[in-house]
C-alpha cells in the first residue's frame, strides 16, 4: 500500500481551476525527492505533465504549477483553464513515475453552466479589480462605446464613452479606448462588490451594425482558510492583498454579529484593548502584503477574521479581503505558565518561558512588546550570548530548567520595566507566549550593598542578606556575563541582622574575591533557587581601583560605607545619584550606538514575522 494520499476523485467545470493536494510521509528523503503529476495512458504508462524539478509539459504551459511544502509533507498541483480534454486518470507521486510511490486521482471536467455563446467569464475576488475587454470592428471605431449590466430582463447602462457613469459605480469605474491600432475598448471596475456580479454586455455602436460582447462577472467572497491553533500559542495571519492597495491603510478585524467586523488592529494605529501586549502588525512589503501575529491565544479569540485594505482602516464595501476561521484547541500542547509576573521596584522577576521540547537546540529570545504604531517587539536577550546594552548586568536568559522551559531573570526593576514581554524561539513559531510584568508596592527581599569598589590585589567580601522565607532555598552568588551567570563559591555567615521579625532562619551569605584583578570588575548576583527553578536575585556592581592602602575590604550595609554624593536611606541602603558612580547602565545611550549587533543585525533588533517566521509556517 502506497503511503501517498490525496483526493481519489476531483470534479470541476470548464474554464475553472483545481488545486490537488498530495500528502506524503515527511521523511528527509521524501522531502527532497522529485514530486510529479502524470497522466495515465491506456496502455498503463504515466506521462509526466509537471514535476518539482521544473519540467512542464506543453499541455500545461502557462496554466499549471507544482509547489512542494516539505515542512508539511504535502505538494500541491494547481491546474487552471480546465477543459474537458483534461478529464482522465492521473497519478501524483514521489520519485520515478513507475515506482509505485503514488496515488491515483481521477479528474472529471464537465461543461460549464449554460452561458451565452461568446461569453467571456471573469472570476475576480471581492474588492479587487476587473478589466472587461470589448473588441469592435473598424466601422464602429468612432461610435459610442457602452457597457450594460443585465438586471432581470433589462440591460441597465453602467458606463459609456460620452461620460455617463451609473451611480452604483461612481468613483470606481472607467472606460478606456485603446490607441487607434487596437480595435478594443476596456472597462475597468475597482473595489468590486458582491452586487457587481452578473451578466454584462459591452457594445460599440447603437444601430443594427453594432458590435456586442457578453461577459459574465463572478465576484468571489473569499472562503475562510481554516486555522487551528493551540490555546496559549500563537497564530500568524499572512495577508497578501496585491500591489494595487500597497498604499492603502490595512486592517485585521474579527467578525461579530451579522456583517459587523470589529477592528483588531490597523495601520492607522488602532488596536483592540483585548489584544494589548499580544499582537504585532508587521510592516508591509512593497507589494502591500503584511502579517499579523497574535500570541497568548485565548478561547475567546476563536472566530472569523478578515484582513483588508481601506482608507478608513476598517471593513467597507469593496474592501479587498482575505478571511480565516480561527479555532482555538483547548487541549493544548503548550503548558500553562503565568501570564502575569509581579515584582517590586529594586527587586527582580524570574519568568518561565515554554518552548517546543523537540527543539531544545533552537535559539531562545525574549523581547519587550511596544504598542507604538502597529506594535513591535525589540529583542532584549537571546540564548547565544547577546544582551541589549541597556540591560547589561540585570538580564539573563538561562536554558534551565530545560525540557521545554527556559528562564529569563530581570533584576534592578524600575517602574519602566512594567509591560508585556514575549518568549519565542527561532523554531516553532506557534510557541510564542506573552507575560506581563507588573511593578507593585514593596521592598526587595534580598538585601545587598548598593555599589562596591574593590582594590587590586586585595580581598573583597560582599554580603547578601536572605530573609527567613528563603530558608529552604539554595542560595548562591554568581558573576553575570552575557551568556548567563557563572556560579561562584560563597560562605554562609549565619543568621542575618538585616531583618526585623525574622528568626534564625534568615541568612547572610558572602561572596569573597581573593587577590582582586581587573577581570573581577563587573556585575555580581546573589539569588535563590530550588533545583533548576530560579527565584529572586539582587545585583551588585563591583568596580576595581588601584591600591591606596593595604588590607582587605569587607563591604557592609552600614551608613559609614556610604560614598560621597550618595543618598543614604534609613534602612542603611543607598540610592545612588546618577553622577555618583559609573554604573554601566547609565551609559546606555552611548552603548546602544556602539552595539553593532543591535544596529546591524535586524533580526535581533526587533521581532516581526521576519525574525522567526522564516523557517516556515504561516497560519495554516
Amino acid at each position: 500500500k502506497s503511503p501517498i494520499f490525496g483526493p481519489e476523485e476531483v470534479n470541476s467545470v470548464e474554464g475553472n481551476s483545481v488545486s490537488i493536494t498530495c500528502y506524503y510521509p515527511p521523511t528527509s528523503v521524501n522531502r527532497h525527492t522529485r514530486k510529479y503529476w502524470c497522466r495515465q495512458g491506456a496502455r498503463g504508462g504515466c506521462i509526466t505533465l509537471i514535476s518539482s524539478e521544473g519540467y512542464v509539459s506543453s499541455k500545461y504551459a502557462g496554466r499549471a504549477n507544482l509547489t512542494n511544502f516539505p515542512e508539511n509533507g504535502t505538494f500541491v498541483v494547481n491546474i487552471a483553464q480546465l477543459s474537458q480534454d483534461d478529464s482522465g486518470r492521473y497519478k501524483c507521486g514521489l520519485g520515478i513515475n513507475s515506482r509505485g510511490l503514488s496515488f491515483d486521482v481521477s479528474l472529471e471536467v464537465s461543461q460549464g453552466p449554460g452561458l451565452l455563446n461568446d461569453t467571456k467569464v471573469y472570476t475576480v475576488d471581492l474588492g479587487r479589480t476587473v478589466t472587461i475587454n470589448c473588441p469592435f470592428k473598424t466601422e464602429n471605431a468612432q461610435k459610442r462605446k457602452s457597457l450594460y449590466k443585465q438586471i432581470g430582463l433589462y440591460p441597465v447602462l453602467v458606463i459609456d464613452s460620452s461620460g455617463y457613469v451609473n451611480p452604483n459605480y461612481t468613483g470606481r469605474i472607467r472606460l478606456d479606448i485603446q490607441g487607434t491600432g487596437q480595435l478594443l475598448f476596456s472597462v475597468v471596475i475597482n473595489q468590486l462588490r458582491l452586487s457587481d456580479a452578473g451578466q454584462y454586455l459591452c457594445q460599440a455602436g447603437d444601430d443594427s451594425n453594432s458590435n456586442k460582447k457578453n461577459a459574465d462577472l463572478q465576484v468571489l467572497k473569499p472562503e475562510p482558510e481554516l486555522v487551528y491553533e493551540d490555546l496559549r500559542g500563537s497564530v500568524t495571519f499572512h495577508c497578501a492583498l496585491g500591489p494595487e492597495v500597497a498604499n492603502v491603510a490595512k486592517f485585521l478585524c474579527r467578525q461579530s454579529s451579522g456583517e459587523n467586523c470589529d477592528v483588531v488592529v490597523n495601520t492607522l494605529g488602532k488596536r483592540a484593548p483585548a489584544f494589548e501586549g499580544r499582537i504585532l502588525l508587521n510592516p508591509q512589503d512593497k507589494d502591500g502584503s503584511f502579517s499579523v501575529v497574535i500570541t497568548g491565544l485565548r478561547k475567546e479569540d476563536a472566530g472569523r477574521y478578515l484582513c483588508g485594505a481601506h482608507s478608513d482602516g476598517q471593513l467597507q464595501e469593496g474592501s479587498p479581503i482575505q478571511a480565516w476561521q480561527l479555532f482555538v484547541n483547548e487541549e493544548s500542547t503548550i503548558p500553562r505558565s503565568p501570564t502575569v509576573v509581579k515584582g517590586v521596584a529594586g527587586g527582580s522577576v524570574a519568568v518561565l518561558c515554554p518552548y517546543n521540547r523537540k527543539e531544545s537546540k533552537s535559539i531562545k529570545y525574549w523581547c519587550l512588546w511596544e504598542g507604538a504604531q502597529n506594535g513591535r517587539c525589540p529583542l532584549l536577550v537571546d540564548s547565544e550570548g547577546w544582551v541589549k546594552a541597556q540591560y547589561e548586568g540585570r538580564l539573563s536568559l538561562l536554558e534551565e530548567p530545560g525540557n521545554g522551559t527556559f528562564t529569563v531573570i530581570l533584576n534592578q526593576l524600575t517602574s519602566r520595566d512594567a509591560g508585556f514581554y514575549w518568549c519565542l524561539t527561532n523554531g516553532d513559531t506557534l510557541w510564542r507566549t506573552t507575560v506581563e510584568i507588573k511593578i507593585i508596592e514593596g521592598e526587595p527581599n534580598l538585601k545587598v550593598p548598593g555599589n562596591v569598589t574593590a582594590v587590586l590585589g586585595e580581598t573583597l567580601k560582599v554580603p547578601c542578606h536572605f530573609p527567613c522565607k528563603f530558608s529552604s532555598y539554595e542560595k548562591y552568588w554568581c558573576k553575570w556575563n552575557n551568556t548567563g551567570c557563572q556560579a561562584l563559591p560563597s560562605q554562609d555567615e549565619g543568621p542575618s541582622k538585616a531583618f526585623v521579625n525574622c528568626d534564625e532562619n534568615s541568612r547572610l551569605v558572602s561572596l569573597t574575591l581573593n587577590l582582586v584583578t581587573r577581570a573581577d570588575e563587573g556585575w555580581y548576583w546573589c539569588g535563590v533557587k530550588q533545583g533548576h527553578f530560579y527565584g529572586e536575585t539582587a545585583a551588585v556592581y563591583v568596580a576595581v581601583e588601584e591600591r591606596k592602602a593595604a588590607g582587605s575590604r569587607d563591604v557592609s550595609l552600614a551608613k559609614a560605607d556610604a560614598a560621597p554624593d550618595e543618598k543614604v536611606l534609613d534602612s542603611g541602603f543607598r540610592e545612588i545619584e546618577n553622577k555618583a558612580i559609573q554604573d554601566p547602565r547609565l551609559f546606555a545611550e552611548e552603548k546602544a550606538v556602539a552595539d553593532t549587533r543591535d544596529q546591524a543585525d535586524g533580526s535581533r533588533a526587533s521581532v516581526d514575522s521576519g525574525s522567526s517566521e522564516e523557517q516556515g509556517g504561516s497560519s495554516r
Epitope: F5, P7, V10, S12, S17, S19, P26, G73, T74, L226
Partner: nanobody
Framework: QLQLVESGGGLVQAGGSLRLSCAAS????????MGWFRQAPGKEREFVAA????????????YYADSVKGRFTISRDNARNTVSLQMNSLKPEDTAVYYC????????????????WGQGTQVTVSS
C-alpha cells in the same frame, strides 16, 4: 458552533447497502471540509471518507480510505446542508459507529477536530 446530526444507520446483511446522512446546522456549510469516520468496538476511530468543496473554483475533491474504495461514495447537498455516505457491498468488518465530522487537512494526513463531531449512528452488518 457547527452541529452535526447523523441518521440512516441500522442492521443490514452482508452484501447489502445503507445510506447515511449528516445534517449540519449553525455555520456556513459550504466553507467546510466534511467527512465520515467510524469506530468499531475496542478499536480506534478511523477515517472513512471526506469531501471538500471549493466554491471559488466550483471544484469538489473526494477522499476515501483504502478499505472502502469502490464500495462507498460520499456526496453533499449544499442546498440542504447535508453530507451522505452511500455504502454498498457491506461486509461484517464495516460494523461500527459512524461519525460525521468537520475536517481539517494538516501536515501529511487527515486529522479530525474533536470539537465538531456528530453523536454517531450504529451500522451493524451481519453475516
Amino acid at each position: 458552533q457547527l452541529q452535526l446530526v447523523e441518521s440512516g444507520g441500522g442492521l443490514v446483511q452482508a452484501g447489502g447497502s445503507l445510506r447515511l446522512s449528516c445534517a449540519a446546522s449553525g455555520r456556513t456549510f459550504s466553507t467546510s471540509t466534511m467527512g465520515w469516520f467510524r469506530q468499531a468496538p475496542g478499536k480506534e476511530r478511523e477515517f472513512v471518507a471526506a469531501i471538500q468543496w471549493s466554491s471559488a473554483s466550483a471544484s469538489t475533491y473526494y477522499y476515501y480510505a483504502d478499505s472502502v474504495k469502490g464500495r462507498f461514495t460520499i456526496s453533499r447537498d449544499n442546498a440542504r446542508n447535508t453530507v451522505s455516505l452511500q455504502m454498498n457491498s457491506l461486509k461484517p468488518e464495516d460494523t461500527a459507529v459512524y461519525y460525521c465530522a468537520n475536517l481539517v487537512f494538516r501536515v501529511g494526513a487527515l486529522k479530525e477536530r474533536d470539537d465538531y463531531w456528530g453523536q454517531g449512528t450504529q451500522v451493524t452488518v451481519s453475516s
